[in-house]
Interface confidence: medium
Amino acid sequence: SEVEYRAEVGQNAYLPCFYTPAAPGNLVPVCWGKGACPVFECGNVVLRTDERDVNYWTSRYWLNGDFRKGDVSLTIENVTLADSGIYCCRIQIPGIMNDEKFNLKLVIKPAKVTPAPTRQRDFTAAFPRMLTTRGHGPAETQTLGSLPDINLTQISTLANELRDSRLANDLRDSGATIRIG
């Protein structure tokens, strides 16, 4: 089931998706698509990165974070009601059944009459939390051996966590790092 995120018409929507490269530059290709994740790749691609850079994007869709550190969260600028729907973030690790794919549901609400806050960046719902492995320490690390040397830590998003977007902003701005391993 998809995790739900909300934004208002005219605001920027934020759909979180993360992994942790072993080192900046050791990147895994990532695609963002409109619609649920298919078997391979992304459908209706809106943005794509390769091992080095963002190599495809469409207007209003961009990565606001440092994708070279694994922050591949999608920002959708100036959203309209038509932007509602499911979005797929896919971390394209080599191997069948090895991709990490996440379906995120974006719900766009009509704009409020009240003036928008000065802080424009809209962390629409849950600040993502890391999935842990039962019986372990705080979380898990995946090493991709002889493939691109990645400690993959794609973080699943849980909609009921840290719903206060101001808190999410504060956490983010205070330099809190979400790193597994």
């Epitope: 069948i96 090895n98 002889s146």
Partner: antibody, heavy 119, light 110 residues
Framework: QVQLVQSGGGLVQPGGSLRLSCAAS????????MSWVRQAPGKGLEWVSG????????YYADSVKGRFTISRDNDKNSLYLQITSLRAEDTAVYYC????????????WGQGTLVTVSS | SYVLTQPRSVSGSPGQSVTLSCTGT?????????VSWYQQHPGKAPKLMIS???ARPSGISNRFSGSKSGNTASLTISGLQAEDEADYYC??????????FGAGTKVTVL
């Protein structure tokens, strides 16, 4: 060389539960997706479940969804299959297998462990 | 309930060639080049013989070859030998992100 050593099979009553284990060695375990395949006595192979290298993305055959749970512990190089609400038709030899990275195949298999569901 | 269709048995004399078929749909065999073939002797674990329709893993004899046309994959064993007598299973990745197998073909060396 790649080794997959299985344990955890046995005789279980209908409705019971069982956890199968598969200890891996000889390869970078967390790099590879893994699968469970079963074979009922005198029958063919049936893929039942798979899991991504990180352990965060599980896959299930429709026939076992809701009753089987696949998991892995990359620190211990181990793969698990938790089976609940066991039925007579779950009686089979269960194999763990390593998914190849570059092909769609299962190149390495465990020795198999027999699960018998009977009252 | 096996999704892929295989003949129940095939037989041949030593030195002959036999071809095993595996028929699926556009959602599995026809849709992806992720067709594999496995050999299984009684009481043993399956052994990968062919991957990705026609690729032979190292250590597998070149007497084994694979191909695909449309929704049907084939395994050909040439120069049949006594040790080839076994059950052979085809498998395919599917559009549901799962694997499916055939019911298996018993190869008998006469």
């Amino acid at each position: 060389q790649v080794q997959l050593v299985q344990s955890g099979g046995g005789l279980v009553q209908p409705g019971g539960s069982l956890r199968l284990s598969c200890a891996a060695s000889g390869f970078s375990f967390s790099t590879y997706a893994m699968s469970w395949v079963r074979q009922a006595p005198g029958k063919g192979l049936e893929w039942v479940s798979g899991i991504s290298g990180s352990g965060r993305t599980p896959y299930y055959a429709d026939s076992v969804k809701g009753r089987f749970t696949i998991s892995r512990d990359n620190d211990k190089n181990s793969l698990y299959l938790q089976i609940t609400s066991l039925r007579a038709e779950d009686t089979a030899v269960y194999y763990c297998a390593r998914n190849d990275i570059f092909t769609g195949s299962l190149p390495d298999w465990g020795q198999g462990t027999l699960v018998t569901v009977s009252s | 309930s096996y999704v892929l269709t295989q003949p129940r048995s095939v037989s041949g004399s030593p030195g002959q060639s036999v071809t095993l078929s595996c028929t699926g749909t556009s959602s599995d065999v026809g849709g992806y080049n992720y067709v594999s073939w496995y050999q299984q002797h009684p009481g043993k674990a399956p052994k990968l013989m062919i991957s990705d329709v026609s690729a032979r893993p190292s250590g597998i004899s070149n007497r084994f070859s694979g191909s695909k046309s449309g929704n049907t994959a084939s395994l050909t064993i040439s120069g049949l030998q006594a040790e080839d007598e076994a059950d052979y299973y085809c498998s395919s990745f599917t559009s549901s992100s799962t694997y499916v197998f055939g019911a298996g073909t018993k190869v008998t060396v006469l």
